[in-house]
């Protein structure tokens, strides 16, 4: 089955720049199908833009302004790039690659879209560290000795663009667990986000991970917020607690506060 | 030009409660066209539900169906037994590929209609309130609550700053909250809330301790200073006299 | 302060065509989409066109489509609009007016936030 | 084309009164292409409202947009005797024309 993946979740450029998307196809070989762009404005319907056959034949809509966006494909990397030219307000919007994809029975056919990249423009050069800053609270003894649940809570402040995602994961799992977030919140001329992860009793000894997708993220990777394992009654930590690493390869600090 | 057009722009459903998403076509005969559903959840992601011809997307089958209203040019799509997963953006789209003769291979989309999942109605259930806390960052955890109308009020003579709370449906489809503010004096904060008529308190769920169960760290063993080497900790610390604060450096 | 200035407007004859201009200054108007909206005596605001900031996007009102064109000299901070086969129906108050610009957070909001005094148009014989 | 349609024609306030002004588009209007204008006589408009609830720069807090789909509203919370002019609701988004209501004027009464 094909897959499509937009490693960029947000492209951010100022006026008149260039703006190059990707979209990254496997579980088929993109020399032997189309790749298609759609775009979606706020409120708009998503609206076809080009695409790309098997052949590399380029066919645009009618409508779209000539010279403004270019397709192609890189087969080495099963890639395909939309570029977006001379980059103006009215090219703001989220950009989706898709391909129509086989189903075993003959003649049956959908079409799968990638998961988008918002193209953000601004009039300015953001120069300071607008990556997403976090924060983490740990659950309550309350909550732990009563519910037999524990809460753990992401706080992510400080960035831009608003685009961000966030999902957790138990330490050496690779599975997504169910997590209930906030809406994303302006705070001057940033955003912050919040999401929390209500996990049973026996696995609260288990490291659980905020994971945080953001294109400001150091080095273009995920930002892995570590979670330390608790004990009910009480919280040890081992040394590699202290040593816990995100995806950049960055010392995570645990800084632990006691009152009183 | 063709044209899909969604019949509503939002349809709240009930959780496990059926409900129905219509979108007609103008200009055209929907016969002459390839329906087709996708819903967009959260985060952007586009995923297939449904095309004519009896093909549904991974997980998709049991609890939706499609259909066509060749009489009336609209398209259907029921959801059998919604759940809080199925809240998102739904969109109609056609294509004429495989019909032959002049064919597109495009989709044309709608408008997106908005549903939104609230829990079915049930016996009112008293919230749980925990405070959780971090240097001047309190969260106040509302757990398990029905109806959804709730006030949260984070008790605090020195407020820095206060966030709206964040309402959402649980799994078990009751209401979950969290409300966030910074405060000076955060030690002190405490969180209280109106629900159904009644105020609920932070404290009601505090758990007594005996103080002398507790190990205090030395000063400085209060932060961890960056270091190539890790030491272990030497103390043992109680969950509810621990913040925990991860920074990247 | 930021300004729009118009000119160009004047008494013409159905049929007849004018060339309006618009002149920005303190700010760089190749930042900026810009519009056209006109308001005729004793009635409401209509939009007339708009040009994106690079003029790759140009879109006209029904009313005026064919027979108006919108440009903009970004090197001269100047916006026009070229009007031929004037009616009696276009006799108006011609504005030129700046859509807000894409910093800060609401980067992809849009509103008229500068306006020029506009410039009067009429069409009679 | 999407219609804007504002009511009422006329609202006849005294100052210190709050003016309720609504804008109805004849389909679903993105929030972030909903401005409203304030205009008096013999001067160019003024934008008031963006993105359907922000305020412009120097615009007063007594005026506040609300709304979203198709129904919105301008709210000036307490009349001064400046606020006695015509206003417009506009959506500048979806396809072209960037339609303009017909207006709203809020007079003395």
């Known amino acids: 089955a094909g897959h499509l993946e937009q490693p960029q979740i947000s492209s951010t450029k100022t006026l008149s720049k260039t703006a190059r998307l990707e979209c990254v196809v496997s579980g088929i070989t993109i020399s032997a199908t189309s790749v298609y762009w759609y775009r979606e404005r706020p409120g708009e319907v998503i609206q076809f833009l080009v695409s790309i056959s098997y052949d590399g034949t380029v066919r645009k809509e009618s409508g779209i302004p000539s010279g403004k966006f270019e397709v192609d494909r890189i087969p080495e990397t099963s890639t395909s790039t939309l570029t977006i030219h001379n980059v103006e307000k009215q090219d703001i919007a989220t950009y989706y690659c898709a391909l129509w994809e086989a189903q075993q029975e003959l003649g049956k056919k959908i079409k799968v879209f990638g998961p988008g990249t918002k193209l953000i423009i601004t009039d300015k050069q953001l120069d300071a560290d607008v990556s997403p800053k976090p924060t983490i609270f740990l659950p309550s003894i309350a909550e732990t000795k009563l519910q037999k649940a524990g809460t753990y809570l992401c706080l992510l402040e400080k960035f831009f663009p608003d685009v961000i995602k966030i999902h957790w994961q138990e330490k050496k799992s690779n599975t997504i667990l169910g997590s209930q977030e906030g809406n994303t919140m302006k705070t001057n001329d940033t955003y912050m986000k919040f999401s929390w992860l209500t996990v049973p009793e026996k696995s609260l000894d288990k490291e659980h991970r905020c994971i945080v997708r953001h294109e400001n993220n150091k080095n273009g990777v995920d930002q892995e917020i570590i979670f330390p394992p608790i004990k009910t009654d009480v919280i040890t930590m081992d040394p590699k607690d202290n040593c816990s690493k995100d995806a950049n390869d960055t010392l995570l600090l645990q800084l632990t506060n006691t009152s009183a | 030009a063709i044209e899909l057009v969604p019949e509503h722009q939002t349809v709240p459903v009930s959780i496990g409660v059926p409900a129905t998403l219509r979108c007609s076509m103008k200009g055209e005969a929907i016969g002459n066209y390839y329906i087709n559903w996708y819903r967009k959840t959260q985060g952007n992601t586009m995923t297939f539900i449904y095309r004519e011809k009896d093909i549904y997307g991974p997980g998709f089958k049991d609890n939706f169906q499609g259909d066509i209203d060749i009489a009336k040019n609209l398209a259907v799509l029921k959801i059998l037994a919604p759940s809080e997963r199925d809240e998102g953006s739904y969109y109609c789209a056609c294509d004429t590929l495989g019909m032959g003769g002049e064919y597109t291979d495009k989709l044309i989309f709608g408008k997106g209609t908005r549903v939104t999942v609230e829990p079915r109605s049930q016996p009112h259930t008293k919230p749980s309130v925990f405070v959780m806390k971090n240097g001047t960052n309190v969260a106040c955890l509302v757990k398990e609550f029905y109806p959804k109308d709730i006030r949260i009020n984070l008790v605090s003579s020195k407020k820095i700053t206060e966030f709206d709370p964040a309402i959402v449906i649980s799994p078990s489809g009751k209401y979950n909250a969290v409300k966030l503010g910074k405060y000076e004096d955060s030690n002190s904060v405490t969180c209280s809330v109106q629900h159904d008529n009644k105020t609920v308190h932070s404290t009601d769920f505090e758990v007594k301790t005996d103080s002398t169960d507790h190990v205090k760290p030395k000063e400085t063993e209060n932060t961890k200073q960056p270091s190539k080497s890790c030491h272990k900790p030497k103390a043992i610390v109680h969950t509810e006299k621990v913040n925990m604060m991860s920074l990247t450096v | 302060e930021v300004q729009l200035l118009e000119s160009g407007g004047g008494l013409v004859k159905p049929g007849g065509s004018l060339r309006l201009s618009c002149a920005a200054s303190?700010?760089?108007?190749?930042?900026?989409?810009m519009n056209w909206v006109r308001q005729a005596p004793g009635k409401g605001l209509e939009w007339v066109s708009s040009i994106s900031s690079s003029s790759s996007y140009i879109y006209y009102a029904d009313s005026v489509k064919g027979r108006f064109t919108i440009s903009r000299d970004n090197a001269k901070n100047s916006l026009y609009l070229q009007m031929n086969s004037l009616r009696a129906e276009d006799t108006a108050v011609y504005y030129c007016a700046r859509d807000r610009g894409v910093g800060g957070t609401d980067y992809y909001y849009y509103g008229l936030d500068v306006w020029g005094q506009g410039t009067t148009v009429t069409v009679s014989s | 084309e999407i219609v804007m349609t504002q009511s009422p024609g006329t609202l006849s306030l005294s100052p210190g009164e709050r003016a309720t002004l609504s804008c109805r588009a004849s389909q679903s209007v993105s929030s972030s292409y909903l401005a409203w204008y304030q205009q008096k006589p013999g001067q160019a408009p003024r934008l008031l409202i963006y993105g359907a609830s922000s305020r412009a720069t120097g615009i007063p807090d007594r005026f506040s947009g609300s709304g979203s789909g198709t129904d919105f509203t301008l709210t000036i919370s307490r009349l001064e005797p400046e606020d006695f002019a015509v206003y417009y609701c506009?959506?500048?988004?979806?396809?072209?024309?960037?339609?303009f209501g017909q207006g709203t004027k809020v007079e003395i009464k």
């Open positions: 303190r700010f760089t108007l190749s930042s900026y989409d």
């Open positions: 506009q959506q500048y988004g979806s396809s072209p024309p960037y339609t």
